[in-house]
């Protein structure tokens, strides 16, 4: 706290508020009889800038010229030092350094809508640190002038509150902004414009869309605009897209026909307006209209595949599978699939509509030539049917692809490769690669996946519905006319040693040897494709290494004979399973003693 200046005065010239870079003159003078008591020439006046001495003088007054002060406030204090006493405060001064306003730049004015008011913005330039008064002046025809002031440190916008009208759209108006503070003033360059230059139309409103006869090819967009609008631009895009389609239209009078919309697609539409071909600015975009285009009948054809399963001497089970049409092919909500099954020689046909599934299973006689046709229907019609002749897909041995292999290819992908069949490879019309999770029971409910490959391809990357640590049964079919050949292999995308070994459920004696039966390892514990089982045995209470027998893994096999056991010796037996990654832990242990005679 600086005491009021009882002992002396500080005067400041030219002012307490000065321009950056200028000099200030500070004078400190003692009032009469306020110096040191005995000898006035012992008076030592000291000037401090904050806490640092910058000048001193013996006598009744001190004069100091100060330069180089920074922006903002600097505190000066004048003190008196007498012999054998502390310094006494005389008086203080704060000097504030600011800058004169820079020339306001980029003055631009706008009137939002035909009924709006003229408002201008500008760039202030460097912060002055001082109260700066901005005066905005607008002059028009017939010596009309308008003026508006704003008294704020950070002013860069003013609204005149007046409305320019289109009576004389080519009349010139000139705007200028002047900034004044206690350190100086500056004016912008004048900005000259006409009504058409500065009126920015309001965005269009009341946007609607109509589809004549519920057809996507007869679509009209309607909207409302201010009266003087000449130009519009429309932009639209499917709701799931980031790219806009853009259309410019002149004298649209609030409507425009759109010809390239896709059916059954949600679109977002926006419109902007402008008063003149090359003057003025575009309005903001309107609020979005979202609308779904009508359905059209599906295009494209379903990808259909099938499986045959022998039931008995007279019957077979046919399972049909098909893939959904893509959105662009479905062109609407698929309501049902129509499946037609026909015996080609007798002409008998049955048709069924399937909803909610992409598969169908039926039982047909093993005799006769059968064909199926499958199509997809939406509210507007059906796709062209996909026709397939039901044949024995693996009958032609010479058409079987050779050297089929399946290798892991990164996360959840399997690369299947093969060689063309021995029979004339050029006869192959296409390959089909089919895969499904391996289930020991051959469960037909397990989903089937397939992809088609061109006849010159000898590999396919399968990634759809592939999970880690699951074994897949993979078949490669070569199709030629009404014949087919196939080869199969097991494959996985990722594997590790099985989590458990097989569970031995029975050991039986047969003619001096034993038959071991086991339960399959649960699929979720196999951790990939099993390559082998191992059966281990050793004499009970013996420390010798166990003997083992390795059996190649076959899906349906769950028993195996062993004939190298000695009669009347008690053995301990157990099993493990192996994938390419390693061997499982032991399964359960069983003891067995062969009763028969030794050979």
């Amino acid at each position: 706290k600086i005491d009021a200046c009882k002992r002396g005065d500080v005067t400041v010239k030219p002012s307490h508020v000065i321009l950056l870079g200028s000099t200030v003159n500070i004078t400190c003078s003692l009032k009469p009889r306020q110096g040191c008591f005995h000898y006035s020439r012992r008076n030592k006046l000291i000037l401090y800038k904050f806490d640092r001495r910058i000048n001193f003088h013996h006598g009744h007054s001190l004069n100091s010229q100060v330069t180089g002060l920074p922006l903002g406030t600097t505190l000066f204090v004048c003190k008196l030092a007498c012999i054998n006493s502390d310094e006494i405060q005389i008086c203080g001064a704060e000097i504030f350094v600011g800058v004169a306003p820079e020339q306001p730049q980029n003055l631009s004015c706008i009137q939002k809508g035909e009924q709006g008011t003229v408002a201008c913005t500008w760039e202030r330039g460097r912060d002055t640190h001082l109260y700066t008064e901005y005066t905005l002046q607008l002059s028009g025809p017939k010596n009309l002038t308008w003026q508006k002031q704003c008294k704020d440190i950070y002013c860069d916008y003013l609204d005149f509150g007046i409305n320019l009208t289109p009576e004389s759209p080519e009349s010139n108006f000139t705007a200028k902004v002047t900034a004044v503070n206690s350190l100086g003033s500056s004016s912008s360059l004048p900005s000259t414009f006409t009504f058409l230059d500065i009126v920015r139309p309001l965005p269009p409103w009341d946007i609607r869309i109509k589809f004549q006869k519920a057809s996507v090819s007869r679509c009209t967009l309607y909207w409302r605009d201010e009266g003087l609008v000449l130009l519009n631009r429309l932009r639209y895009r499917p709701s799931n897209s980031r790219l806009w389609n853009m259309v410019n239209v002149t004298k649209a009078k609030g409507r425009h026909d759109l010809l390239d919309l896709k059916p059954f697609t949600e679109y977002e539409f926006q419109i902007s307006s402008k008063l003149h071909l090359y003057k003025g600015s575009w309005s903001d975009w309107s609020e979005s209209l979202r609308a779904q285009t009508p359905e059209e009948e599906p295009t494209g054809m379903l990808d259909v595949w099938y499986m045959k399963r022998h039931i008995d001497y007279s019957r077979q089970q046919i399972s049909l599978f098909w893939k959904n049409l893509s959105v662009s092919e479905a062109r609407g909500k698929i309501l049902h699939y129509q499946v037609t099954l026909q015996e080609l020689t007798g002409g008998k046909a049955m048709t069924q509509n399937i909803t909610g599934h992409t598969s169908w299973t039926t039982v047909i006689p093993r005799t006769g030539n059968w064909a199926v046709a499958v199509s997809a229907a939406n509210s507007k019609g059906s796709s062209l049917p996909t026709r397939i002749n039901i044949m024995n897909l693996c009958e032609a041995g010479l058409l079987a692809p050779r050297q089929v292999s399946a290798n892991s290819e990164g996360m959840d992908n399997i690369l299947v490769t093969w060689q063309p069949p021995r029979k004339d490879p050029s006869a192959v019309q296409e390959y089909v690669v089919e895969w499904r999770e391996l289930h020991p029971g051959g469960d037909t409910q397990v989903p089937l996946n397939w992809l088609r490959s061109r006849p010159y391809n000898v590999s396919a990357l399968i990634s759809e519905n592939i999970k880690s640590y699951i074994c897949y049964e993979i078949r490669v079919y070569a199709l030629s006319g009404d014949q087919g050949g196939c080869s199969s292999i097991l494959g996985n995308s990722k594997h590790k040693a099985p989590l458990s070994g097989p569970h031995i459920n029975a050991i039986t004696e047969e003619k001096g040897s034993i038959l071991i039966s086991w339960n399959s390892i649960p699929v979720q514990e196999q951790m990939g494709c099993l390559l082998h089982y191992r059966i281990y045995w050793k004499e009970r209470d013996s420390n010798s290494q166990p003997q083992l027998c390795e059996i190649p893994y076959r899906v349906s096999q769950n028993s195996h004979p062993i004939n190298s056991l000695q009669p009347r010796v008690t053995y301990v037996l157990w099993m493990t399973a192996l994938t390419a990654a390693g061997e499982s832990s032991h399964g359960n242990e069983r003891e067995f003693c062969l009763q028969g005679k030794a050979n």
């Epitope: 600086i2 500080v10 307490h16 203080g92 001082l130």
Partner: nanobody, 119 residues
């Protein structure tokens, strides 16, 4: 922002004396500088005298030795004691307060009081 009310103007004979007073109300905290300006008809507004919150002063050359500015920080009042008045001192006298506003100064002005010095 601060509101300023000037008082004390009027008609005075040349050579006479008068005191102008200015009272600050509202958010009068941190008033850095209180000043008197004047504007004669047809002329620019000019600084007469100013006083900082620490008591330092500045005077225009034309009034130095005749006018004295003083300030009561507690009451937020600034007085301008005018002696040896001359006809050229005739003007509207405005009170101004500069307040800190962040690292900037924000100014407030009074509406002014008329001083007429007759010869």
């Amino acid at each position: 922002q601060v509101q300023l009310q000037e008082s004390g103007g009027g008609l005075v004979q040349a050579g006479g004396s008068l005191v102008l007073s200015c009272a600050a109300s509202g958010s009068a905290a941190l008033i850095f500088l209180m000043s008197w300006y004047r504007q004669a008809p047809g002329k620019q507004r000019e600084l007469v005298a100013e006083v900082s919150r620490y008591g330092s002063t500045t005077y225009a050359d034309s009034v130095e030795g005749r006018f004295t500015i003083s300030r009561d920080n507690a009451k937020n009042i600034v007085d301008l004691q005018m002696n040896s008045l001359k006809p050229e001192d005739t003007a509207v006298y405005y009170c101004k307060a500069d307040q800190y506003y962040g690292d900037s100064l924000r100014s407030s002005w009074g509406r002014g009081t008329q001083l007429t010095v007759s010869s």
